[in-house]
Interface confidence: low
């Protein structure tokens, strides 16, 4: 039997097609302000957005087994819709200015328009034509199509104010709408022509859905829920009345979700997810910045990207032709990301978070999250405050800088410490990197009066200063041992600046426009870093052929940047302490003839077989 | 249904501290995405923000009163007070708080007080 | 900071006829970054209208917002008699939030 949902703010209800019903609320905890909805039969789950929570949900239809499926990146993720034959999400999120898809449970999420697009609002598929419809509500409103992976973009209806509700009926092959400018409800051919005006007399018809011979609308001022023959407008009958603000309506029943394409056998035969095309046609798709393998069926995850943080996000851009938008990872609890790194070989990524006082790692996709640093005192979590951090990747170790204690740590990356290796009375360690290469760590030292760049072995040996003058708040360290080049910002001088690995060939890089610079990172040949004032990263060209660049702006609370370079397995077997850390118990240290000598933190002293530490 | 009431002294001289209390009830700033913001109204004139605090304790203050402000919260007591140091004359206004809920608009305000900067 | 410039800065309608304010940004401050909010004397400021174009509850489907990139408009379709007031626009696109200088409608 068919029957009509609604989402009413923290409400999602059903109600029967015919009048004087009473409206049943579906039994869902921690609803804030449900906005899009749309359900799958075969499943008999419903999907909903909530622009308040900037979530996505679902649920099935007795309000069981309720799970957020997206739960980061979005902003006003107001038009939203099942494909039902490839088990597929689309979202149009009128904040980010995207429209995406993810599988029903939200994995494998990739962008499929993100250029060019104005507020993007209400969206329909058409599953087995291959086809998606949006309205835009931006300076230009407009209805527009899509291939359903992002391509074949065409604008269909220029001509119409803030369009919404946007149905298909799917037997008459006519397209209908709400005008939010005007108040009608219009319709038109699945290309925009030959257009109708159903309703011309409504006060504010804001949701809208078909089914069979009637079309179903929410009005805003009548504050109902009113339905009319689909084609001419007459026949009108209220619902309900007395509904404030329902945001969106349908028809749950199967005849609004039939039809076969390719997708709906085996997924396509894809690895990740399965996007239909016209003319019933489909192609594989991928997560955002995976690449489709040769066989046209299955992705491979990136190798080269950028990383960047903000407050409460990690996120991930990639270089390409496509200028690919850059993506929100799924990692949970972030309170206040302070610095992040990167292991390439487990592609686990590491962060610092100074909300909590704790060095934590996890994968790409959030899972196997793990409390590498946390303080030994649970109930003093300032005993101590990580600032910065730097992987060994051939030793497997984390160097960490430390606010509450002023030393230089070091800890396995399974969390075991190693201990400390740099102290001092007037010690002020910040800003750490590690070049395990050439066996050197380098280091800000925030003094007072007296700022400097030191280098020492990564034992905290053969300590020297590089830079004591021209330095004011050196907050950022960055290293390329491929360049042999040492980067380093200071906030308060508001200059980048580079030297030779020695301390040789100081020069200024830039020093023009730059307020609050927090991070950089090498990637290929140019340098990238953040400035947490302009809200903004950039990067300079260091062959001095392309200058500087802005990369993206308008991003708040920026805190760290690191590029992630393809790691060669085989030059990273070659390394001396690859392989069983070099034999060493504590500290493996590469010497310049290119052998290894073990080493030990501060308080252990290395044993007479060379490789062991102990006790002094 | 959500409510917030400002309250501090009516008269201020000048160099002297101003400290206002907004009390609110309806909701909770230990609820994600949340917020209270300060902003005020010189008789006959515009609005002017001063400063929000949200949930999470992130705080930002207008820039030409910024060394001038502080803004903190007691989520207990469902308070948050402001603290505007060297009044002068040209301060005087009426000082509202308002409830935000992200995006930064404020959607819940208080009466307002009149604080009047005279020696 | 962004300056937000409102005009004109006093209209002068009878009820029934159709108002229309103008808020310029001195920047690009997006398509869902402004709000609208009406104050009448005595009174503290409410909020008509967020992210450019959505109403806030409660409000009259007689207002609407629109607007994109630097030029926003709020839009009274008829003048009721409780809409003479003084209107303000706030950008929230970039810190510090800013308010316009206010446009007051007043009745002819």
């Known amino acids: 039997e068919a029957f009509l949902l609604f989402s009413r703010r923290a409400d999602i209800r059903r109600i029967s097609l015919e009048t004087n019903n009473n409206n049943v609320a579906i039994p869902l905890t921690g609803v804030k302000e449900a906005s899009a909805l749309d359900f799958d039969v075969t499943d008999n789950r419903i999907y909903w957005t909530d622009i308040s929570l900037k979530t996505i949900s679902r649920a099935f239809m007795n309000g069981s087994a309720l799970e957020h499926v997206v739960e980061f990146g979005l902003d006003y993720p107001e038009g939203m819709a099942v494909d039902w034959l490839g088990k597929n999400l689309y979202w149009a999120d009128t904040g980010t200015n995207r429209i995406e898809v993810s599988k029903l449970d939200g994995q494998h999420r990739q962008v499929l328009v993100w250029k060019d697009l104005d507020s993007p609002r209400a969206l329909a598929l058409d599953p087995a034509e291959g086809f998606m419809y949006w309205t835009e509500w931006g300076g230009k409103p407009k209805i527009d199509r899509a291939a359903m992976d992002g391509s074949e973009r065409t604008t269909l209806v220029p001509n119409v104010g803030r369009a919404n509700g946007l149905t298909i009926d799917y037997a008459k092959r006519r397209l209908y709408w709400t005008d939010l400018d005007t108040n009608l409800i219009e319709s038109s051919n699945m290309l925009g022509l030959n257009r109708e005006v159903i309703a011309d007399d409504l006060p504010h018809p804001f949701g809208l859905t078909q089914y069979q011979d009637y079309i179903y609308w929410t009005d805003w001022s009548r504050r109902s829920i009113e339905r009319a023959n689909k084609t001419s407008g007459q026949n009108r009958t209220i619902i309900q009345g007395h509904l404030d603000y329902v945001m969106d309506i349908l028809v749950f029943h199967s005849s609004r979700q039939s039809g076969w394409n390719e997708c709906a056998s085996s997924n396509g035969h894809c690895s990740h997810l399965c996007l239909a095309v016209p003319v019933g046609g489909f192609v594989c798709g991928c997560p955002a910045h995976y690449s489709l393998n040769a066989d046209n069926r299955t992705c491979s995850a990136p190798t080269t990207f950028l990383l960047f943080s903000q407050k409460s996000a990690i996120n991930r851009m990639v270089i390409d032709e496509q200028q690919s938008p850059d993506i929100i990872l799924p990692i949970h609890s972030l309170r206040n990301v302070r610095a992040i790194d990167y292991d390439p070989l487990d592609k686990q990524l590491y962060w610092i978070d100074s909300r909590q006082n704790m060095i934590r790692k996890a994968q790409e996709d959030g899972s196997q999250g793990f409390t590498v640093v946390v303080s030994s005192v649970p109930s003093q979590n300032l005993e101590i405050q990580p600032y910065d951090l730097s992987i060994d990747i051939y030793s497997r170790y984390i160097y960490w800088t430390c606010e509450a204690t002023n030393v230089i740590n070091v800890t396995r990356l399974d969390g075991r410490s190693v201990g400390v290796v740099l102290k001092g009375e007037q010690d002020r360690p910040r800003a750490v990197v590690v070049n395990p290469e050439k066996g050197y760590m380098y280091f800000t030292n925030l003094q007072e009066r007296s700022p400097k760049i030191e280098r020492a072995a990564l034992d905290g040996t053969e300590r020297e200063v590089l830079f004591f003058s021209g330095l004011s708040k050196p907050i950022a360290l960055a290293l390329d041992s491929r360049l042999g080049k040492l980067f380093w910002a200071d906030s308060d001088l508001r200059r980048i600046e580079s030297s030779d690995l020695s301390g040789a060939n100081r020069i200024v890089l830039e020093d023009s426009n730059i307020l609050q610079p927090v991070g950089l990172t090498v990637f290929e040949n140019w340098l990238y870093w953040i400035d947490k004032q302009q809200q903004m990263i950039e990067k300079i060209d260091m062959t001095g052929r392309e200058g500087r660049t802005k990369v993206q702006a308008r991003i708040a609370q920026l805190s760290d940047i690191h590029a992630v370079k393809e790691l060669n397995l085989q030059e990273y077997r070659q390394h001396p302490c690859a392989q069983d850390n070099g034999g060493c118990s504590h500290i493996c240290l590469v010497k310049g003839d290119g052998t290894t000598r073990c080493s030990c933190p501060m308080h252990l002293v290395l044993l007479q077989d060379e490789l062991s530490c102990g006790e002094p | 249904q959500v409510q917030l009431k400002e309250s501090g002294p009516a008269l201020v001289k000048p160099t002297q501290t101003l400290t206002l209390t907004c009390t609110f009830s309806g909701f909770s700033l230990s609820n994600r995405g949340g917020g209270v913001g300060w902003i005020r109204q010189p008789p006959g004139k515009a609005l002017e923000w001063l400063a929000w605090?949200?949930?999470?304790?992130?705080?930002s203050y207008s820039t030409s009163l910024k060394t001038r402000l502080t803004i903190s919260k007691d989520t207990s007591k469902n308070q948050v007070v402001l603290t505007m140091t060297n009044m002068d004359p040209v301060d005087t206004a009426t000082y509202y708080c308002?409830?935000?809920?992200?995006?930064?608009?404020?959607?819940?305000w208080g009466q307002g007080t009149l604080v009047t900067v005279s020696s | 900071d962004i300056v937000l410039t409102q005009s004109p800065a006093t209209l002068s309608l009878s009820p029934g006829e159709r108002a229309t304010l103008s808020c310029r940004a001195s920047?690009?401050?997006?398509?869902?970054?402004l709000a609208w909010y009406q104050q009448k004397p005595g009174q503290a400021p409410r909020l008509l209208i967020y992210g450019a174009s959505n109403r806030a509850t409660g409000v009259p489907a007689r207002f609407s917002g629109s607007g994109s990139g630097t030029d926003f408009t709020l839009t009274i379709s008829s003048l009721e008699p409780e809409d003479f007031a003084t209107y303000y626009c706030q950008q929230y696109y970039d810190y510090p939030q800013t308010f316009g200088q206010g446009t007051k409608v007043e009745i002819k």
């Open positions: 605090i949200d949930w999470d304790d992130d705080k």
């Open positions: 308002a409830r935000f809920h992200l995006p930064l608009v404020f959607d819940s």
């Open positions: 920047q690009f401050i997006g398509s869902r970054y």
